[in-house]
């Protein structure tokens, strides 16, 4: 026979021949990294034919790490299933929990041993510090000094020492997040107030009132015979300002041709639609019609269109 | 009070496939994990795996694998363990036991132990 | 493997007793913890934990029992042995795959 066969996981004990007599017997051994477990023969025969009897090296069994538990609210999870040398483990805590240490340890083989790359990390629980105060404003759980994962707290704005309140910016609940951050910023107090939207030739037709604070709406048409420009919905934002502005109403114009087109309604488009006739060339209209009248609106005398301070 | 309930004693046909039930009352199941333990008769005990039931995670001997089948009810916070091409080798007496999680585990109460017994 | 020592260990009441356990394989874990236990199964009962993690004696266990050792090598003593105590004890290690059972010591009368 020729040369024994070669094994991954097991060495021929002395040193090979070039050529072996009949009936001739090879022993092999385990290698280093790589333990026996009985019963499978781990040698072979040089039989009749010139070939080596059957031999496998599946006796030879890879050196195993130690066994790792779960961490405390997380898992150790084997790469491949397998605690042998050369793969690795992962390690992830549970929701509401943070890792502290190596998050993935390799088995070595140290000499013959098997040995993690380190010591197995270990899962703390999510705590947050006490959320932001804010100016003019308070959140609940004021008195308490560490969070828990998930908790959370909730904004209100004090009584305003003037006549406007103090109106909420941003939203009122936050919660203790991952990596032990609040889930946004705290929002702020602080009195928002718009002046009164005035749109001349055209009028208020919800969101009525006297004063307009954060986040009043007021929807708006023009006048027959003119037509929207800008939107007809306004927001008052955080600034104290109408968003989008305050529209305007322009005259329709009439087209080119002679005969002037009739008009029986008011034409009302949204900011993103402008009437044909607003691209025609000739001078815009400077007339201002007195300020309207409607039941429930104040006249401009009653001091809402004074400047905020 | 913690307790670990096992199914009575089964008597099975060769061939054929048996499931042990341990229910578990008194602690938090998910906070635990499951180890099984085979005692043959007049002899040692050997363990057959572990199953984590807040993962469903398992573990085994593997001596065990392909032969025993670990899961878990949450609900019914009931463990248990499939054998399966039963042989008289697996006549024995089956243990749960509750490990405690984390480092630092170990095996604190066992169930009385189910008889399985394969005869024809 | 855990090679228990002795296999039978005949007693007097009142005397002490020590079983001992060699590993194979060291059974300190990278996390710190030697994870060998001593369990007791007394004549047709399951086994009951006596010591977990080499010395810590289980809630409820007297304090006659004790546990030490490192390493590879463990040993269980029972200061004065009591009828109760009567039973095939174990040992038992959870450190390396698979985990395994000594062949037990049967603790009886002489």
């Known amino acids: 026979c020729e040369e024994p066969p070669t094994f991954e996981a097991m060495e021929l004990i002395g040193k090979p021949k070039p050529y072996y007599e009949i009936g001739e017997r090879v022993d092999y051994k385990c290698k280093k990294g790589y333990f026996y477990i009985p019963p499978l023969a781990t040698h072979t025969i040089c039989d009749r034919n010139h070939t080596w009897l059957p031999v496998s090296d599946d006796a030879c069994y890879r050196e195993t790490c130690p066994y790792i538990r779960d961490p405390l609210n997380g898992q150790a999870v084997p790469a491949n299933g397998t605690y042998e040398f050369g793969y690795q483990m992962h390690f992830i805590c549970n929701e509401g929990y943070y890792l502290i240490g190596e998050e993935i340890l390799y088995c070595e083989l140290k000499g013959s041993v098997a040995i993690w790359s380190g010591k197995p990390p270990i899962c703390e629980k999510v705590l947050c510090t006490p959320p932001p105060k804010i100016k003019n404003g308070k959140h609940t759980f004021s008195e308490v000094e560490v969070f828990e994962y998930l908790d959370a707290v909730t904004y209100s704005c004090d009584p305003a020492p003037g006549p406007d309140p103090f109106s909420l910016i941003g939203e009122s609940t936050i919660y203790c997040g991952d990596n032990s951050v609040w889930s946004r910023a705290a929002p702020e107090c602080k009195v928002v107030k718009c002046r009164f939207p005035v749109v001349e030739n055209g009028k208020q037709i919800s969101g009525f009132g006297k004063k307009f604070y954060y986040k009043a709406t007021v929807m708006f048409e023009c006048d027959k015979g003119f037509y929207l420009d800008g939107s007809d919905t306004i927001v008052c934002d955080s600034n104290s300002t109408w968003d989008p502005p305050v529209p305007k109403c322009l005259k329709v114009l009439p087209p080119s041709s002679t005969k002037p087109p009739a008009l029986s309604h008011s034409v009302s488009t949204s900011s993103t639609t402008k009437s044909p006739a607003s691209s025609a060339s000739g001078p815009r209209p400077t007339y201002k019609p007195p300020v309207s009248n409607y039941p429930g609106y104040p006249k401009p005398e009653e001091g809402i269109l004074d400047s905020l301070d | 009070e913690i307790q670990l309930q096992q199914t009575g004693p089964e008597l099975v046909k060769p061939g054929a496939s048996v499931k042990i039930s341990c229910k578990a009352s008194g602690y938090s199941f998910t906070d635990s994990i499951m180890l099984w333990v085979k005692q043959s008769h007049g002899k040692s005990l050997e363990w057959i795996g572990n199953?984590?039931?807040?993962?469903?995670?398992?573990t085994y001997n593997l001596k065990f694998k392909g032969k025993a089948t670990l899961t878990v009810d949450k609900s019914s916070s009931t463990a248990y363990m499939q054998l399966n091409s039963l042989t008289s080798e697996d006549s024995a007496v089956y243990y749960c036991?509750?490990?405690?999680?984390?480092?630092?585990?170990?095996?604190?109460?066992w169930g009385q132990g189910t008889t399985l017994t394969v005869s024809s | 493997v855990m090679t228990q020592s002795p296999l039978s260990l005949p007693v007097n009441i009142g005397d002490q007793a020590s079983i001992s356990c060699k590993s194979t394989?060291?059974?300190?874990?990278?996390?710190?913890?030697?994870?060998l236990d001593w369990y007791l199964q007394k004549p047709g009962q399951s086994p009951q934990l006596l010591i977990y993690l080499v010395s810590n004696r289980f809630s409820g266990v007297p304090d006659r029992f004790s546990g030490s050792g490192s390493g590879t090598d463990f040993t269980l003593k029972i200061s004065r042995v009591e009828a109760e105590d009567l039973g095939v004890y174990y040992c038992f290690q959870s450190n390396s795959l698979p985990f395994t059972f000594g062949s037990g010591t049967k603790l009886e009368i002489k």
């Open positions: 394989k060291s059974l300190l874990n990278s996390d710190g913890f030697t994870y």
């Open positions: 036991a509750r490990g405690l999680r984390g480092y630092g585990g170990y095996f604190d109460y």
């Open positions: 199953i984590n039931p807040y993962y469903g995670s398992t």
